[in-house]
């Protein structure tokens, strides 16, 4: 009788993460008597994956009865597959020996490859912000995928970036990788809506991609313009003087209005208007009495946003531009705020 | 060459249910995903949901989450779609088509189309 | 969802013109954009992909071009096997999305 053949028919095997893998063997001949273990990997450090006479494998399940006499279908199911169960899967015959089975003959082996999803793409900014003009980094970084093949893609504002650098690790085989991706983004005054997106697109994904987000909001600077403008007032001996604070980004911003170098008020924006372009314009305004003042007066708005070192705009008040109020002297000075 | 060969017309009652089949062959079936379109008569094309090969996850568009449902045959390279208790609004023609990935997720392979007319 | 709409749902067009189909969608799209050509009692046939880029096959008379919200499909010199009903999808995101088709008719 012809000598016993152990047939694994697979030589590989390709398994979606968290399926059922299922490796087939065969034996050709009932003889010699003696039971089928299952390992992964080859030599003296392979592991045991089952043993069809004694232990435990809760994972494993066989295809076919082996308690039956004649059984010589030797096939097993392993369930929930993940990456580490990647690798070459060997049916090995023993020859039932006294006090320990003899390994008899071992299948060619087959192949296990498992395909695993990317984990969702987490795309992160710089620590600071930035002001227009400046170019920032963007990181993304998705983990878990196998096979190694992967394409990443960069988007802002429905383009495509192209100033990027991408790495997938480890370079050589292993169950599963990462990638991880660096951008170069130059922000510009109208980014405040804007967003930089991160598209994975794996075999195991087909037809959606993965995509991570990174609002520009949270990165972006815009430094306030101001202007100072004098308008007069019913009141003769009166001037309105306004700072018009336009187009930041964020809204915190902290205003002092200066009368010849010294404080006046100090306030924070509050109400303000949102530009279609998200930055905000804010505006003060001071009510300043021209007949308590007997020299000009040098104005200063000075505006604080955002931490940053503060911003003015001066202007130069002429008293002698204003006739005297021929009535009794109201206040010195009214100052107020309009919110706009 | 890539095909994808569809099942012939079906005329059903109001209730019963249908299913077409979608072939596949010329390409590795579980690479790429199985998208299904809807186009009634004299109307536009309206995307369904479509397959993953590979994982056996089906994506429904709103419109066709309840009576609709997509399977796959694997070892055949067949994709199928079954419409339950049908009713009148489901006379269409109903396409099949391949999606691409990597960067294009679009449908590039498209079966013949299967007519359905619900009738009573 | 994205809402695709092809302005005109019909064009009455003379053989060797220039024709050009519009698709608008409701937000940005990032170029993944596809054209189909559909003739009566066949399934649609890809013609562009990726907003721009033309499938193998595909004439040449034949382009696509746009960006962000707005795309367009362009026919330098219209042939008599032109005549079809054309139409735009989004494929950025699901639900994917067909704009309302364009049908050309020779005058």
């Known amino acids: 009788e012809e000598e016993l053949q152990v047939i694994q028919p697979d030589k590989s095997v390709l398994v979606a993460a968290g399926e059922t893998a299922t490796l087939r063997c065969t034996a050709t001949s009932l003889i010699p008597v003696g039971p089928i273990q299952w390992f992964r990997g080859a030599g003296p450090g392979r592991e045991l994956i089952y043993n069809q006479k004694e232990g435990h494998f809760p994972r494993v399940t066989t295809v076919s009865d082996l308690t039956k006499r004649n059984n010589m279908d030797f096939s097993i199911r392993i369930g929930n597959i993940t990456p580490a169960d990647a690798g070459t899967y060997y049916c090995v015959k023993f020859r039932k020996g006294s006090p320990d089975d003899v390994e008899f003959k071992s299948g060619a082996g087959t192949e296990l490859s498992v395909r695993a999803k990317p984990s969702a793409p987490v795309v992160s900014g710089p620590a600071a912000r930035a002001t227009p003009q400046h170019t920032v980094s963007f990181t993304c970084e998705s983990h878990g995928f196998s096979p190694r093949d992967i394409t990443l893609k960069w988007f802002k504002n429905g383009n495509e970036l192209s100033d990027f650098q991408t790495n997938v690790d480890p370079v050589g085989e292993s169950v599963s990788y990462s990638i991880h991706s660096t951008a170069k983004v130059v922000l510009t005054r109208e980014d405040v809506h804007s967003q930089v997106i991160c598209e994975v697109a794996h075999v195991t994904l087909q037809g959606d991609p993965l995509r991570g987000t990174a609002n520009l909001s949270e990165t972006i600077r815009v430094p306030p313009t101001l202007e100072v403008t004098q308008q007069p007032v019913r009141a003769e001996n009166q001037v309105n003087v306004t700072c018009q604070v336009r187009k930041f980004y964020p809204q915190r911003l902290q205003l002092t209005w200066l009368e010849n170098g010294n404080v006046s008020r100090t306030e924070t924006a509050s109400t303000v208007t949102e530009n279609k372009d998200g930055t905000y314009n804010w505006m003060s305004w001071l009510l300043v009495n021209v007949s308590a003042h007997r020299d000009d007066v040098k104005l200063t708005c000075q505006v604080e946003h955002d931490g940053q070192p503060a911003v003015s705009k001066s202007h130069d008040l002429k008293v002698s531009a204003h006739p005297k109020e021929q009535g009794s002297n109201t206040a010195a000075e009214n100052t107020g705020s309009n919110e706009r | 060459q890539i095909q994808l060969v569809q099942s012939g017309p079906e005329l059903k009652k109001p209730g019963e249910t249908v299913k077409i089949s979608c072939k596949a062959s010329?390409?590795?079936?579980?690479?790429?995903?199985m998208h299904w379109v809807k186009q009634a008569p004299g109307k536009g094309l309206k995307w369904m949901g479509w397959?993953?090969?590979?994982?056996?996850?089906?994506t429904y568009a709103e419109d066709f989450k309840g009576r609709f449902a997509f399977f796959l045959e694997t070892s055949a390279s067949t994709a199928y779609l079954q419409i339950n208790n049908v009713k009148n609004e489901d006379t269409a023609t109903y396409f099949c088509a391949r999606g691409g990935y990597g960067s294009n997720y679009v449908m590039d392979y498209w079966g013949q189309g299967t007519s359905v007319i619900v009738s009573s | 969802d994205i809402q695709m709409t092809q302005s005109s749902s019909s064009f009455s067009v003379s053989l060797g013109d220039r024709v050009t189909i519009t698709c608008k969608a409701s937000?940005?799209?990032?170029?993944?954009l596809a054209w189909y050509q559909q003739k009566p009692g066949n399934a649609p046939r890809l013609l562009i992909s990726g907003a721009t880029s033309l499938e193998t096959g595909v004439p040449s008379r034949f382009s696509g071009s746009g960006s962000g919200k707005d795309y367009t499909l362009s026919i330098t010199s219209l042939q008599t096997e032109d005549v079809a009903t054309y139409y735009c999808q989004q494929y950025w995101n699901s639900p994917r999305t067909f704009g309302g088709g364009t049908k050309l008719e020779i005058k």
């Open positions: 397959k993953n090969t590979e994982t056996g996850e089906s």
């Open positions: 937000e940005d799209i990032y170029n993944r």
């Open positions: 010329g390409y590795t079936f579980t690479d790429y995903a």
